[in-house]
Interface confidence: low
């Protein structure tokens, strides 16, 4: 008869490399009688015999782990015990290896030049994955501003426009190597001003061009801003090459103006700007002419846009602080009354109160506004809109109009120069020379009244009211 | 708290090698560039290169092109620069500096004297 | 390589400003930074990137920069600012660092 043994481990457990998903065995063969009881036990913890994870043979002597997890790996323990003496123990670990993966790969970033990028790269493997970096075709090679972080994630300092481009990361270890998907750096670039307009000093009426070019990524657009107000004559020309836009403003000359260039590009929800002025100065802009009661320049309105001449100078009176804007309002104030003219009245009144405010104008050393010739108003007084006219008459002298209302542009007949005395010192209308077959005698024409199909001009929705401060005889 | 504490002062002859190390806490030591900069004795500031302590990669300026060598220990936080052959006028105070999360250098070493003489 | 140049001193009056400029090609398209050094210490960065301060450093510490000079402005001067000043940039093409040759302030 056997006699009893207590238990030795003859072959102790030994560090076991596994890769993930394969088989690991532990072999704990042990010699003992009577035979013993075999448990196992993982980082101190019983490994329950039918956990469907593990295969346990060979009484006991055999643990096999069926499909590796990366969570399995730790220290393996088999314990024996006989009733004979006390239990026996060996140990030893499980490394679970694994290739190298890329758990959170990069994305493609937008990033503002001058700004920290970070591409993330973060890895799993055992041995644990080296991260290195390609841009394009080629390694990237690390310097004071590009580095490749503890993390794998790569960090670019002070981002510049040649940062820009294709990066994959690339994990790597003793069991392989794992490449991320291409993902895209865009760096963008706040607009900048790389040529700024010229000033110049010119003599009135003529054309100069300013030049203003910027870049950026993405190319900015460029505006321009004439004495704070967007410019509204002028021909722009633009042309893009490589992120840089060219843009000339092309402008006739009437009177000094502050020109500013504006570059402006959209970073996400943000916009960045660039800014820069030059003055356009008119050569014998001279003391007289500062002093002057007003400048020529091309009207740019809309009320009267029909009425006047196309590209004609008119006169703008300084005494306004905004004289275009002043005057453009006072038109404006003036058109819807004429709503309620007749059809005969209306165009005559729209082509005097126009050319009245809007009077022709000649440049010279001291620009000259040219009034509308005595004749012509009077035709619109006494022969277009006689009714209209004794009836505004008849208000003001009942009081019905307000003093405040002086202002209006309406002009004096009587004070006006005739054309008789000199065709040049004066403006006639053209609306009315266009009816001169049914008008044949200035100034007293109270007999010869013209036909009532006078053609409608644009209807406009501005208002006028006509004011009883100016004398109509 | 952060900062970088470096060994102490060394006298050398011509021709001989001299490393200082360069303790680094209250960071995390493989997250940021170590740079070593001297100053000899009533001259400027002389940056001498850099060493990724997470990589290993370095760079050096020119000058010192050959005969520096950087390299760091990450189980310890420790960043070491030796320079060799050297002469009287490598006579300086060395400084580690790095810069935490900008390009400048906003934490410094409290500087290495290092004596060059026969 | 690239070259920064500092005046080698600056002189100024309590309560007063000065000015302490730094030279260098193109050097507006880089970021510069300021250190100051006293006697026997270790430089302390007072202005990064033209124009940011480190937390610590009093407003009287400011920067800018552009064209082909950067300045350190430190208005209100104590008695306690006279040092060595060295402004500093990152050289792109070289991938080194570079220090300006130094200028001592002195407090009158």
């Known amino acids: 008869e056997k006699l009893p043994k207590a238990p030795v481990i003859t072959t102790p457990l030994e560090t076991v490399d596994a890769l993930v998903e394969e088989v690991a065995t532990f072999m704990c063969a042990v010699e003992s009688y009577p035979q013993p009881e075999i448990s196992w036990t993982r980082n101190k913890i019983l490994i329950k015999l039918f956990d469907t994870r593990y295969s346990i043979r060979e009484n006991g002597q055999l643990l096999t782990i069926l499909s590796v997890e990366d969570s399995d790996d730790g220290i393996y323990c088999c314990i024996a015990n006989n009733g004979v003496g006390g239990a026996v123990e060996s140990c030893g670990a499980l490394q679970v290896k694994m290739k190298p993966k890329i758990t959170r790969p990069p994305i493609n970033v937008k990033i503002i030049e001058g700004l920290k990028a970070v591409l993330p790269c973060t890895t799993m493997g055992n041995p644990k994955p080296s991260v290195s970096w390609i841009k394009g075709d080629n390694a990237l090679r690390e310097n004071s501003r590009i580095a490749v972080l503890e993390s794998g994630s790569l960090r670019i300092h002070n981002v510049q426009k040649e940062d820009a481009g294709q990066y994959r990361c690339v994990a790597k270890n003793s069991l392989g190597t794992a490449y991320s998907k291409l993902v895209k750096l865009e760096v963008e670039v706040f607009a900048r001003i790389l040529r700024a307009p010229e000033s110049h000093n010119v003599t009135f009426g003529s054309f100069v061009t300013l030049r203003c070019t910027a870049i950026g990524i993405p190319v900015p657009t460029i505006s321009w801003i004439e004495n704070g107000n967007a410019v509204s004559s002028g021909s722009i020309q633009e042309s893009v090459k490589d992120r840089v836009i060219d843009s000339r403003l092309q402008l006739f000359i009437t009177k000094p103006g502050l020109y500013t260039c504006i570059a402006t590009n959209k970073h996400g929800e943000k916009f960045s700007t660039a800014k820069a002025a030059a003055t356009v100065s008119i050569a014998e802009w001279s003391k007289s002419q500062k002093d002057s009661q007003g400048y020529c320049a091309q009207y740019r309105g809309e009320v009267c846009d029909a009425v006047l001449a196309k590209d004609a100078l008119v006169f703008f009176n300084t005494s306004y602080r905004d004289p275009e804007d002043a005057q453009e309002l006072l038109i404006h104030t003036a058109w819807n009354e004429l709503k309620a003219v007749s059809p005969l009245c209306r165009p005559a009144a729209e082509a005097l109160l126009c050319n009245h405010l809007f009077q022709e104008c000649s440049p010279g050393v001291v620009p000259t506004p040219m009034p509308i010739c005595r004749e012509y108003c009077l035709a619109v007084k006494e022969l277009f809109c006689a009714k209209e006219w004794q009836a505004m008459e008849g208000k003001a002298h009942r009081g019905l109009y307000r003093s405040g209302m002086h202002l209006l542009p309406v002009p004096e007949c009587s004070k006006l120069p005739s054309m008789h005395r000199d065709p040049t010192a004066c403006t006639r209308l053209p609306y009315l020379d266009y009816k001169k077959e049914n008008i044949t005698t200035f100034p007293s024409i109270t007999s010869s009244r013209p036909s009532a199909d006078i053609p409608n001009l644009p209807a406009s929705t501005s208002s006028f009211a006509v004011s009883p401060a100016y004398s109509m005889t | 708290q952060v900062q970088l504490v470096q060994s102490g002062a060394e006298v050398k002859k011509p021709g001989a090698s001299v490393k200082v190390s360069c303790k680094a806490s209250?960071?995390?030591?493989?997250?940021?560039?170590m740079h070593w900069v001297r100053q000899a004795p009533g001259q400027g500031l002389e940056w001498m290169g850099w060493?990724?302590?997470?990589?290993?990669?370095?760079n050096y300026a020119q000058k010192f092109q050959g005969r520096v060598t950087m390299t760091r220990d990450t189980s310890i936080s420790t960043a070491y620069m030796e320079l060799s052959r050297l002469r009287s006028d490598d006579t300086a105070v060395y400084s580690c500096?790095?810069?935490?999360?900008?390009?400048?250098?906003?934490?410094w070493g409290q500087g290495t004297m290092v004596t060059v003489s026969s | 390589s690239y070259v920064l140049t500092q005046p080698p001193s600056v002189s100024v009056a309590p309560g007063q400003t000065a000015r302490i400029t730094c030279g260098g090609n193109?050097?507006?398209?880089?970021?510069v930074h300021w250190y100051q050094q006293k006697p026997g210490q270790a430089p302390v960065l007072v202005v990064y990137?033209?124009?940011d301060r480190p937390s610590g450093i009093p407003e009287r510490f400011s920067g800018s920069n552009s064209g082909n000079t950067a300045t350190l402005t430190i208005s209100r001067v104590e008695a306690g600012d006279e040092a060595d000043y060295y402004c500093?940039?990152?050289?792109?093409?070289?991938?080194?660092?570079?220090f300006g040759t130094g200028t001592k302030v002195t407090v009158l």
């Open positions: 500096a790095s810069g935490l999360g900008i390009s400048a250098f906003d934490i």
């Open positions: 209250g960071y995390t030591f493989t997250g940021y560039y």
């Open positions: 060493i990724n302590p997470h990589s290993g990669g370095t």
């Open positions: 193109n050097i507006g398209s880089k970021s």
């Open positions: 990137d033209d124009s």
């Open positions: 500093q940039v990152w050289d792109s093409s070289s991938d080194h660092y570079v």
